[in-house]
Each structure stands twice: as structure tokens, then as C-alpha cells.
């Protein structure tokens, strides 16, 4: 058993049929010695008396809010949550496996630049009675500070018969050095509670590996005289790190016909313009990627050829 926060405790249980459970001793936080009784949740049934209460925690029915009273007055309370371990593996029932970039990916994180600011998100099909608390650091043995805000419900989607809820959190490295080579990874830890079930999820990454630039901005077409060719121009996204001479992007320019089956013409360039043939009913799209490190491409910025 360990303390998650003041008055909230996590009981770690091996979860299998007829498991013996864990013996837990609760102590009433009071100088009083006698006349103390214990109850669980909203029940008025007295579970025991005295300054301590010993319980055998085997299942969710044994978890909950234990309260000690004297003469109708609440003295203190302890919330017991359960963390299940099945076949040596901690349960992951609360969050959904996003399966990208690999199986057992529960937390996904992205950064728009090298400023030390990043966003993580996760999915669940559980609609309410949820608690999320997020902590982060760079490195784990001698951790350097990363400040995370509160998680927020960022999207709701219908997936077949189920509703899926996306939660996200923004974090900022306290003393980020955008130009420095990273040697220690960022660690993100999410404590998740659903009703009386506790789970924790972690992700470890370098900022350079989760970089995904915003799409190029101000995408414009300029027809070239007496030609089917156009000059496409764009700018670095506002959110990208500066100076651009150091934090450079490379670009992919794509001409795509109306039909997805039509052949796509693609040009790669380090410049912020390119000359392409604009076919009727086609569209031109441009995306960006860090020039010197193969992290994710941005989403496409698009304009119609006409």
C-alpha cells in the first residue's frame, strides 16, 4: 500500500481467483483513543471500533472511502483504490491502446518545435468518474523539471457503437535549451483513476523524436506566363523554432488530381517555393519536416489549382 496523495492510498493486488489479497491497517488521524467507529462509503454499518481498523482487501467491494467517527463527528477518512496485477502485468483497462507507432501505446506526444513545450494525449471509452494527474521530468535518476497543466477533455468521437473520449495535456520543460543535443529522455507519467481502480501509464521520449511541425503557412500560387506551370510559394509556420537558418525545414510539394487514383507528382525541396505543373481540377499541397532529423511530417497545407 502506498499514498497517492493526502488521504488517498493505492493497494496493489495480485488479481487471480481466490487470491488472498492484502491486509491493510487504517489508522484514525486523531488524538482520541476510544469511542471511535469505522464506516465505508455511504453505509452506516459499523465495520469496527478503535483507533485502527484492520481489513483484508481482496476485491473492489473492499475499496472505497473509510471514515472514522466519534459521537457523530467525522475524525478522518482514507480512500482506498485498487491497482490490479494480472499474470505479473499491471492492468491497463482505463486507457485505450492507440496501437501507433506500436502496440501498447497508451500515451502519444507531439512537439511543434524545440522550445521544450509538448502535448500528450490519450483515449478512453469511459465517460465519467475519471481522474487524471500528470507529472513529467527530464531523466528519472536526477530529474530536471517539466511543468504540466491539468488534463482536459479535448475531443469526443463516435466509433461504431462506442463513444471515445480524447484527453490532452500540455507540458513545458522548465529550463529548455532548444539547440542542445538531448542525452536524457523526457518521462511522462499519468495517474488514472476510474471509480476505485487506479492505473498508471508512462511514456519516454526525446523532443527530437516527437517533433511534428505545423503545416507551412501562406501557401500561394503564381501562374507563369505562357505556361501550364505555376510557382508555389509558402512560409515557415509561426510555431517553428527560430532562427530558421539553424532550425531548418525541408518540404514536400504534391500535385494531386481530383481522383485519389490519379498519379501524384511530388517534388522535395529545401526552399520555400517550387515550380510545378498545375493540372485542371488538381490541388497543390505542401508539408514540412525537420531538415536534419527525420521526425514526423506536418499535415498538408493545400490550395486548388484553379
Amino acid at each position: 500500500i502506498w499514498e497517492l496523495k493526502k488521504d488517498v492510498y493505492v493497494v496493489e493486488l495480485d488479481w487471480y481467483p481466490d487470491a488472498p489479497g492484502e491486509m491493510v491497517v487504517l489508522t484514525c488521524d486523531t488524538p482520541e483513543e476510544d469511542g471511535i467507529t469505522w464506516t465505508l462509503d455511504q453505509s452506516s454499518e459499523v465495520l469496527g471500533s478503535g483507533k485502527t481498523l484492520t481489513i483484508q482487501v481482496k476485491e473492489f467491494g473492499d475499496a472505497g472511502q473509510y471514515t472514522c467517527h466519534k459521537g457523530g463527528e467525522v475524525l478522518s477518512h482514507s480512500l482506498l483504490l485498487l491497482h490490479k496485477k494480472e499474470d505479473g502485468i499491471w492492468s491497463t483497462d482505463i486507457l485505450k491502446d492507440q496501437k501507433e507507432p506500436k502496440n501498447k501505446t497508451f500515451l502519444r506526444c507531439e512537439a511543434k518545435n524545440y522550445s521544450g513545450r509538448f502535448t500528450c494525449w490519450w483515449l478512453t471509452t469511459i465517460s465519467t468518474d475519471l481522474t487524471f494527474s500528470v507529472k513529467s521530468s527530464r531523466g528519472s535518476s536526477d530529474p530536471q523539471g517539466v511543468t504540466c497543466g491539468a488534463a482536459t477533455l479535448s475531443a469526443e468521437r463516435v466509433r461504431g457503437d462506442n463513444k471515445e473520449y480524447e484527453y490532452s495535456v500540455e507540458c513545458q520543460e522548465d529550463s529548455a535549451c532548444p539547440a542542445a543535443e538531448e542525452s536524457l529522455p523526457i518521462e511522462v507519467m499519468v495517474d488514472a483513476v476510474h471509480k476505485l481502480k487506479y492505473e498508471n501509464y508512462t511514456s519516454s521520449f526525446f523532443i527530437r523524436d516527437i517533433i511534428k511541425p505545423d503545416p507551412p503557412k501562406n501557401l500561394q500560387l503564381k501562374p507563369l506566363k505562357n505556361s501550364r506551370q505555376v510557382e508555389v510559394s509558402w512560409e515557415y509556420p509561426d510555431t517553428w523554432s527560430t532562427p530558421h537558418s539553424y532550425f531548418s525545414l525541408t518540404f514536400c510539394v504534391q500535385v494531386q488530381g481530383k481522383s485519389k487514383r490519379e498519379k501524384k507528382d511530388r517534388v522535395f525541396t529545401d526552399k520555400t517555393s517550387a515550380t510545378v505543373i498545375c493540372r485542371k481540377n488538381a490541388s497543390i499541397s505542401v508539408r514540412a519536416q525537420d531538415r536534419y532529423y527525420s521526425s514526423s511530417w506536418s499535415e498538408w497545407a493545400s490550395v486548388p489549382c484553379s
Epitope: 496523495k5 488517498v8 472505497g64 468518474d129 487524471f132 494527474s133 500528470v134 491539468a150 477533455l153 483513476v193
Partner: nanobody
């Protein structure tokens, strides 16, 4: 430490509405209402956290929780009040996301405001 102050309690007739307010001394991401009737355990009423809400079954459809983040204030609009809603109503707060119903999850507490519903 964030301070919470409840207001708006009072004596009303069965079926009447009442609006409670909870003012926080600083930004509080999650704010909740609990209530405690004489001789009863403190029970969850409603919570609002980053726009998400959760209600106790006993108040669903009658009570509405809302927040004005600019004023660091939460409200509980109580309609169709019943004698069994009589209790001291407490405001609770937390600095993280929760729609949980257990009061140990919450970090800060107000002193409470009395709501009495007469039949």
C-alpha cells in the same frame, strides 16, 4: 492554498429554485459540490472540470453546475428542490482533472452553506 467560500444558502419551499455560489481565491481547475445532512456521510452532488460535468443520480435533471473561470467562481443551480435536499452544501476544489465522486480526491474545502427545504 486556495480558499473557497460558499454563499446563496437559505430556507426555501419544496419545489422552489435556489442558486449557490462558490468563490475561489485563485484559479481552481476542478470544482465540486458535496452535501451533508445531519447524521449522514458527506455525499457527492456535482462536479465541473475543464468543461466536463458529473452529477449524483439523485440530482440529475434538477441541478446544474457551471463555472465562470474569469471570476474563479462555480455555481449550482438547484431546481425543483425537495425536503431531502436539506443539508450543508460544501464546495471542493482540485488542481487536476477529475469528475470523481469521492471527497478524498479533492484538495480544498469551503466551510459550507446551509440549505433547508421545507415541505
Amino acid at each position: 492554498e486556495v480558499q473557497l467560500v460558499e454563499s446563496g444558502g437559505g430556507l426555501v419551499q419544496s419545489g422552489d429554485p435556489l442558486r449557490l455560489s462558490c468563490a475561489a481565491s485563485g484559479p481552481t481547475y476542478t470544482m465540486a459540490w458535496f452535501r451533508q445532512a445531519p447524521g449522514e456521510e458527506r455525499e457527492f452532488v456535482a462536479v465541473i472540470s475543464g468543461g466536463s460535468t458529473n452529477y449524483a443520480d439523485s440530482v440529475k435533471g434538477r441541478f446544474t453546475v457551471s463555472a465562470d473561470n474569469a471570476k474563479n467562481t462555480m455555481y449550482l443551480q438547484m431546481n425543483s428542490l425537495k425536503p431531502e435536499d436539506t443539508a450543508v452544501y460544501y464546495c471542493a476544489g482540485a488542481g487536476f482533472y477529475t469528475t470523481g465522486t469521492y471527497y478524498s480526491l479533492y484538495d480544498y474545502w469551503g466551510q459550507g452553506t446551509q440549505v433547508t427545504v421545507s415541505s
